[in-house]
């Protein structure tokens, strides 16, 4: 038993990487519990996370549907145990979030070089092609697969021996660049989508550098 | 096998309480919520509340706060529920019945035999 | 509360009939809607969940729809042993609700 009153939950906010999505609120619940409903502009409220504790909740299952809608959740406040609630009578408490367009708001994921080749003066860098929880027909889809040309990399490269970098860009997951013979280079990545207004790049991967595994080399 | 055993009939006096067990065996007790749902003689089904059992969070249906309680003991994977200042409308069969996986959360996959509470002067 | 408004409340049919039941939502509950079986004097037993999954082990016979607030249980031949009171249930808001039943006999 208890006095204390629900709170409406605060500070709705959406953190996504790559599609993989989770809604997470205030405040930590004292005599209180949550349940998640997330919908579409058009769409039905579909309940998610219930009679929750925790203060988060994870929507991926939901907005992998369709990537390209935009979300609204909100987090409904419950008293746990024989609490009052403060909502007027019969009408629950709840906030709503933001509104969430997954194709134009997930975080781009750290990237990773697959590998590198040399042949003679020229290196071929691979960036891996991760894959989604967005599905189709029952198979997960690539970041490439989902956003096609829209995804594109950015590529920083120096000599082993120098401060000085230089950068290339390519909408493929494969970037061919001019090399000095002799000479080992060290490289790394960003995804970037040249289109949107946030969230545009990705952090950067590790760097890999030749003569250390990942690549093949050809004289 | 994944089974939900009730305690006995009872048959209390108006304004009495009344506790009913409801032991689970043959699953991870802690991983599934329990609900607790009656049925008043020839009516249909009415939900009461439920209990997680891994922190003993309970909600209620308004219509019963401030009179139920629901309980768990983990040591036995047993949860209760306690009904206070009784009236004759809370004669019915009470049912515990688990909550479902992950998939389906508030679907009721396993019941209890239900206990039989009778109010009466 | 969601109101669940459970049609018809009693019928008669023919074994081998299909049998049809609704059940209408006060308002929209996506597909957080499960239908359950209970036979005098026992527990009742869950046969379909989120509107169309059928729980395991349930047969073939027995299935699920929707369309929009409305929810449709479908027995494609009805069987001696489906002689039962039906209900509905919905989730997706809170307090959890049932709907009144629809008790199915054999003519």
């Known amino acids: 038993s208890g006095t204390t009153n629900t709170v409406a939950a605060y500070n709705l906010t959406w953190k996504s990487t790559n599609f993989k999505t989770i809604l997470e609120w205030e405040p930590k619940p004292v005599n209180q519990v949550y349940t998640v409903q997330i919908s579409t502009k058009s769409g039905d409220w579909k309940s998610k996370c219930f009679y929750t504790t925790d203060t988060e909740c994870d929507l991926t299952d939901e907005i992998v549907k369709d990537v390209k809608q935009t979300y609204l959740a909100r987090v409904f406040s419950y008293p746990a145990g024989n609490v009052e609630s403060t909502g007027s009578a019969g009408e629950p408490l709840y906030e709503n979030s933001p509104e969430f367009t997954p194709y134009l708001e997930t975080n781009l994921g750290q990237p990773t070089i697959q590998s590198f080749e040399q042949v003679g003066t020229k290196v071929n860098v691979t960036v891996e092609d991760e894959r989604t929880l967005v599905r189709k027909n029952g198979t997960f889809l690539t970041l490439r697969q989902v956003f096609g040309n829209d995804l594109g990399y950015i590529l920083t490269y120096r000599k082993s021996s120098s401060s000085g970098k230089k950068t290339a860009k390519t909408n493929t997951n494969e970037f061919l660049i001019d090399v000095d013979k002799g000479e080992n280079y060290c490289f790394s990545v960003q995804a970037v989508i040249p289109s949107r207004t946030v969230n545009r790049k990705s952090t950067d991967s590790p760097v890999e550098c030749m003569g250390q595994e990942k690549g093949e080399f050809r004289e | 096998q994944v089974q939900l055993v009730q305690s006995g009939a009872e048959v209390k006096k108006p304004g009495a309480s009344v506790k009913v067990s409801c032991k689970a065996s043959?699953?991870?007790?802690?991983?599934?919520?329990m609900h607790w749902v009656r049925q008043a003689p020839g009516q249909g089904l009415e939900w009461m509340g439920i209990?997680?059992?891994?922190?003993?969070?309970?909600v209620y249906a308004q219509k019963f706060q401030g009179r139920v309680t629901m309980t768990r003991d983990t040591s036995t994977s047993t949860v209760y529920m306690e009904l206070s200042s009784l009236r004759s409308e809370d004669t019915a069969v009470y049912y515990c019945?688990?909550?479902?996986?992950?998939?389906?959360?508030?679907?009721?996959?396993?019941w209890g035999q239900g206990t039989m509470v009778t109010v009466s002067s | 509360d969601i109101q669940m408004t459970q049609s018809p409340s009693s019928l008669s049919a023919s074994v081998g009939d299909r049998v049809t039941i609704t059940c209408q939502a006060s308002?929209?509950?996506?597909?957080?809607l499960n239908w359950y079986q209970q036979k005098p004097g026992k527990a009742p037993k869950l046969l379909i969940y989120?509107?169309?999954n059928l729980e395991t082990g349930v047969p073939s016979r027995f299935s699920g729809s929707r369309s929009g607030t409305d929810f449709t249980f479908t027995i494609s031949s009805l069987q001696p042993e489906d002689i039962a009171t039906y209900y509905c249930?919905?989730?997706?808001?809170?307090?959890?609700?049932f709907g009144g039943g629809t008790k199915v006999e054999i003519k």
């Open positions: 019945a688990r909550g479902g996986s992950k998939v389906a959360a508030l679907a009721f996959d396993i």
């Open positions: 043959g699953y991870t007790f802690a991983n599934y919520y």
């Open positions: 209990i997680n059992p891994s922190g003993g969070i309970t």
């Open positions: 308002q929209d509950i996506s597909n957080s």
């Open positions: 989120d509107a169309s």
């Open positions: 249930q919905q989730y997706n808001f809170h307090p959890l609700t």
